[in-house]
Interface confidence: low
């Protein structure tokens, strides 16, 4: 499944690296029952596989070459040896669809499972009286999600299989030649340009990878992570693990851990500073979720955390799952709040690049005009936000997102519940009472959190006058966790938000930025503003006060300057 | 396969405590996540508290964070539901379910557990 992957993305000198030993804290790796502990041929450990598990359902997959089985349950199989199973059966009533696990040394239904080393559940039929049966195994991970039909996959005929091969490996060679070629001579071009590039690296400054115009850059990094462009966006099937070693524990969330960690280079002693989030082998679908986000190279873009790669880790006591991203210094933008002061030029790019993060994230296209699937975050607060060496924010965690895919019922949307942090919560989140019918509604709810941001950062700038220490919003409200009954209290009940000081109208600017925040977070998500329009707001700031051209902290747009209010 | 059994209810005055046990049979049972349900007189069936299968992860309904918690012994293949400031409205048949599936969002959602308690009655007077 896609082992070879990485060969072609990462640098050459990290995919000759072989399997070295990271270096985990005993608190982080989890222990395995010994009963659990099963080794393959290799003498390798073996772990439990993980295999859609719904039992008997009834099912309307009929006539077709493949079919999802639908079954939301993906379960820890209880034994390393057992398989994933799928069982199709039709008789004159109805069709049911069956999904387990199961040990293949013994039979299910009758039958050995002949075919539990596969990667794919490819239906074989089996004669049933007064029944259509079709039984598959397979061996990867919720492979039986996938059933296959397909008389293409069907292997009964070996003399036509090797026609087959034969046929199309004579047709394929002249195109394969020539797809070599173009690897083999981007590789060179793509070595011999990093090499060129390295020296600007280690000064840190912004590099860009220039895509399809001068207005169209893909940014690959900001100032601080040294990350090379090569490795973007992947999942890491590769059984050679990147050269990683912890190094602190720098952040702890609901799901998983998040360490400071060294990707080593070569040989040398050079090394690239990378953020590494482990989930434990029970946070599987977290994990999931995040890496099906970052899996998506149209999500690229500054204000979003650069994504690396995504590694199952087997470690002697248990699995990990992990995510590797970029590291930025300056933590998260609550802590930045808490600890620092900020200018009014500070919050013009602070607010501003969290707009266009968000605005991005929202997005059915790239800046570029490619198709993109919308997502909204469902999490967005202080503390899911990274600031970057320039000063600008980049959304991470993304273990709550959406993607607003067109193929959603409506009864998908409600099953993904109320989510989030409650501090944080739209008053439709904390009333259940969001209108699923419109995918737009996700987005006004994460547009809402994002007011609440852009309050915690104007709060603390010392543009305003007098700055008082870092509060939440609903700080002095509500305690440090509240739960959504008391957010209901102040959100719904006393339609209660932050206060916006008098003086801090004083400023025009902040002003601005005050008249944007409070149309954000709007009781009625329909009156909120897009992220989109937010973004361009703070533009239209930015020109402001180019054309004013003073200094940052001042009074300075002019009393006529108006903006573009349109949502 | 999990066989659930359930002790430890009755009948308790408001503010009183209680504590429920959920007793399985079957070997691996730490890879089963086990949540309580609580389900009134005339009403649905609702999530109270879920913990995954090492006990890493909790997580409690909004109506009794603070009162009750949930933890769980693997060594002895139970897990127990400590029930404080019982109030009223804690009156209900409380169950415990088993899943093999992972943690994550679907915690309060009965329908992805497949074995269940017997149930065991808690009355709040």
């Known amino acids: 499944m896609g082992r070879g992957l990485l060969r072609g993305l990462w640098p050459l000198h990290i995919v000759l690296w072989t399997r070295i030993a990271s270096t985990i804290p005993p608190h982080v790796q989890k222990s395995v029952n010994n009963d659990m502990i099963v080794t393959d041929n290799n003498g390798a450990v073996k772990f439990p596989q993980l295999c859609k598990f719904c039992d008997v359902r009834f099912s309307t997959c009929d006539n077709q070459k493949s079919c999802m089985s639908n079954c939301s349950i993906t379960s820890i199989c209880e034994k390393p040896q057992e398989v994933c199973v799928a069982v199709w059966r039709k008789n004159d009533e109805n069709i049911t669809l069956e999904t387990v696990c199961h040990d293949p040394k013994l039979p299910y239904h009758d039958f050995i499972l002949e075919d539990a080393a596969s990667p794919k559940c490819i239906m074989k039929e089996k004669k049933k009286p007064g029944e259509t049966f079709f039984m598959c195994s397979c061996s990867s991970d919720e492979c039986n999600d996938n059933i296959i039909f397909s008389e293409e996959y069907n292997t009964s005929n070996p003399d036509l299989l090797l026609v087959i091969f034969q046929v199309t490996g004579i047709s394929l060679l002249p195109p394969l030649g020539v797809a070599i070629s173009v690897i083999i001579i981007f590789y060179c071009y793509r070595v011999n340009r990093q090499q060129k590039l390295s020296s600007t690296w280690e000064t840190g400054k912004t590099r860009k990878l220039m895509e399809f115009s001068e207005h169209c850059a893909i940014i690959l990094e900001d100032d601080r992570s040294d990350i090379s462009s090569t490795c973007a966006n992947n999942i890491n099937h590769n059984t050679e693990l990147l050269p990683i070693e912890l190094d602190t524990l720098v952040g702890k969330g609901r799901f998983a851990e998040v360490y400071k960690a060294k990707l080593k280079q070569n040989t040398s002693e050079q090394f690239e500073t990378v953020a590494v989030k482990i989930f434990p082998y029970e946070e599987y679908a977290s994990w999931k979720t995040e890496k099906d986000i970052f899996s998506d190279i149209n999500l690229k873009h500054e204000n979003i955390l650069q994504f690396l790669t995504a590694e199952e880790r087997k470690t002697e006591l248990g699995k990990q799952y992990w995510l590797i991203t970029a590291f930025h210094a300056k933590g998260n933008l609550q802590e930045y709040l808490t600890r620092h002061v900020i200018s009014w030029e500070d919050l013009r790019k602070l607010g501003s690049s969290l707009a266009r993060g968000i605005a991005h994230l929202h997005s059915d296209h790239t800046p570029c005009g490619r198709p993109k699937m919308p997502i909204v975050h469902r999490d967005l607060k202080s503390s899911n936000i990274l600031v970057k060496n320039d000063l600008t924010c980049c959304l991470c965690d993304f273990g709550l997102s959406l993607r607003l895919d067109p193929t959603l019922s409506v009864d998908d949307l409600a099953n993904s519940g109320q989510v989030g942090t409650a501090r944080y919560m739209a008053p439709e989140v904390l009333e259940s009472r969001m209108n699923l019918e419109n995918v737009e509604s996700f987005k006004q709810t994460d547009v809402y959190s994002m007011a609440l941001v852009l309050w915690e950062m104007t709060s603390r700038c010392n543009a305003v006058g007098e700055v008082k220490d870092y509060e939440p919003p609903f700080g002095s409200k509500v305690r440090e966790h509240p739960c959504v009954e008391s957010m209901k209290d102040n959100v719904l009940r006393d339609r209660g938000r932050p206060e916006i000081p008098s003086f801090w109208l004083n400023h025009q600017g902040i002003q601005m930025v005050c008249e944007t925040l409070t149309e954000c977070w709007d009781h009625d998500p329909e009156a909120r503003l897009t992220a989109q329009c937010v973004a361009e707001r703070f533009s239209e700031l930015e020109h402001l006060d180019r054309l004013s051209g003073r200094s940052c902290s001042e009074e300075k747009i002019p009393e006529d300057g108006s903006l573009n209010t349109t949502k | 396969q999990v066989q659930l059994q359930q002790s430890g209810g009755g009948l308790v005055q408001a503010g009183g405590s209680l504590r429920l046990a959920c007793a399985a049979s079957?070997?691996?049972?730490?890879?089963?996540?086990i949540t309580w349900f609580r389900q009134a007189p005339g009403k649905e069936r609702e999530f109270v508290a879920a913990?995954?299968?090492?006990?890493?992860?909790?997580n409690y309904a909004d109506s009794v964070k603070g009162r009750f918690t949930i933890s769980r012994d693997n060594a002895k293949n139970m897990v127990y539901l400590q029930l404080n400031s019982l109030k009223p409205d804690d009156t209900a048949v409380y169950y415990c379910?088993?899943?093999?599936?992972?943690?994550?969002?679907?915690?309060?959602?009965?329908?992805?557990?497949?074995?269940w308690g017997q149930g065991t009655q808690v009355t709040v007077s």
């Open positions: 913990i995954t299968g090492s006990g890493l992860t909790t």
């Open positions: 379910a088993a899943t093999r599936a992972y943690s994550g969002y679907y915690g309060e959602n009965p329908t992805r557990y497949a074995y």
């Open positions: 079957g070997r691996s049972f730490s890879i089963y996540g």
